[in-house]
């Protein structure tokens, strides 16, 4: 009687079983009642990563400059490339498929985490006594000056934007 | 050489739900995301969401309720199921390799359309 | 919600006219943006990403600009075949995955 499962690594086809390619291998022809399953290496710039009976190799993944990527990791004839973000960029998800310049916090917002390959910079209002006035991917927000500790006087208040302004103290005559 | 196709149902009654499948060759689903566009008739293409190469999925916001997006990377192929289908949803559904990312290989798309 | 503005929706021009159509993100989306051209019946082509890197076998009489929440796709003179639909697409995040209304180009 013809089988109707086969065992693991096996395949069901024309009422028999046959073996499957083994990664890094694709399958050139099936077997037969008098001869085994045969397969091929994938060429160089190919895989298969599994116990397979695909027909054709997968090509190596391709780590697109255009899309922020470089190679990471070499692909095997049984493994695909792995790629990462150029430097000063990060993926745009998990699978990190594209990579983009990591965002600046405006004026008004500083540094709160310092991006890294796979998250964006994340940026924080600057609160009351703190300032950034420039765009940047590193700067926290910096606090006030303090005018007094410089026996000075507050000539110009400071915003989220802006440092206090300081100015000598009116002397009395 | 590296193919997706979009299939399914061409007609959904109201309520229904729609599922199409999206079968891809060349590549495998471990190294590439999938996700799903749909272009209503005369109208502006729409991302509904897509499944990364690690298997997590993502939707559009306006979408999510309604979406789920899976995969069988054995069978390769990446399933689009949406739920309480209305006559608005009737559109060309395409498939696209890639999850976060830009899409350079698109399905020929499938025409579903949605009436009683 | 994320929105991606695409202007104009329509505009006509003549064959070897430059033309210009911007893309107006509602937040930063840094250089997460690409192009694409449509033709009636078929699936859109990638010409664009990363704002303004060419995809493969684009010509060169594209280009795109901008980062940030402004970009700009310009066909320095246009030809017959780019009598299209032209869309924009950010992937800053899946969050920010959307595409623009579309900018129709058609003949004068």
């Known amino acids: 009687e013809p089988p109707t499962a086969c065992r693991e690594k096996q395949y069901l086809i024309n009422s028999q079983c046959c073996s499957l390619c083994q990664p890094g291998q694709k399958l050139v022809s099936d077997c037969t009642e008098f001869t085994e399953t045969e397969c091929l290496p994938c060429s160089e710039s190919e895989f298969l990563d599994t116990w397979n009976r695909e027909t054709r190799c997968h090509q190596h993944k391709y780590c697109d400059p255009n899309l922020g990527l470089q190679v990471q990791q070499k692909g095997t004839s049984e493994t695909d490339t792995i790629c990462t973000c150029e430097e000063g960029l990060h993926c745009t998800s998990e699978s990190c498929e594209s990579c983009v310049p990591h965002r600046s916090c405006l004026p008004g917002f500083g540094v709160k985490q310092i991006a890294t390959g796979v998250s964006d910079t994340i940026c924080e209002p600057c609160p009351v006594g703190f300032f950034s006035n420039v765009s940047s991917a590193f700067e926290k927000c910096r606090p006030w000056t303090s005018c007094e500790t410089k026996d000075l006087v507050v000539q110009q208040a400071g915003t989220n934007k802006t440092d206090v302004v300081c100015g000598p103290q009116d002397r009395q005559r | 050489e590296v193919t997706v196709k979009e299939s399914g149902p061409v007609l959904v009654k109201p309520t229904e739900t729609l599922t199409l499948t999206c079968t891809v060759s060349?590549?495998?689903?471990?190294?590439?995301?999938v996700s799903w566009i749909r272009q209503p008739p005369g109208k502006a293409l729409e991302w509904l969401g897509g499944?990364?190469?690690?298997?997590?999925?993502y939707y559009a916001s306006w979408a999510k309720s309604r979406l789920t997006i899976s995969r069988d990377t054995n069978l390769k192929q990446v399933v689009l199921t949406m739920t309480n289908m209305d006559p608005v949803d009737t559109a060309t559904y395409y498939c696209?390799?890639?999850?976060?990312?830009?899409?350079?290989?698109w399905g020929q798309g499938t025409l579903v359309t949605v009436s009683s | 919600a994320f929105q991606l503005t695409q202007s104009p929706s329509s505009l006509s021009a003549s064959v070897g006219d430059r033309v210009t159509i911007t893309c107006q993100a509602s937040?930063?989306?840094?250089?997460?943006l690409a192009w694409y051209q449509q033709k009636p019946g078929k699936p859109p082509k990638l010409l664009i990403v990363?704002?303004?890197n060419l995809a493969s076998g684009v010509p060169s009489r594209f280009s795109g600009s901008g980062s940030g929440t402004d970009f700009t796709l310009t066909i320095s003179s246009l030809q017959p075949e780019d009598f299209a639909t032209y869309y924009c697409?950010?992937?800053?995040?899946?969050?920010?995955?959307?595409f623009g209304g579309g900018t129709k180009v058609e003949i004068k």
């Open positions: 060349g590549f495998s689903l471990s190294s590439y995301g």
């Open positions: 990363g704002a303004s």
């Open positions: 937040q930063s989306i840094s250089t997460g």
């Open positions: 696209a390799r890639g999850g976060i990312t830009v899409y350079a290989m």
């Open positions: 697409q950010s992937y800053f995040s899946s969050s920010s995955t959307v």
């Open positions: 499944i990364g190469s690690d298997g997590s999925a």
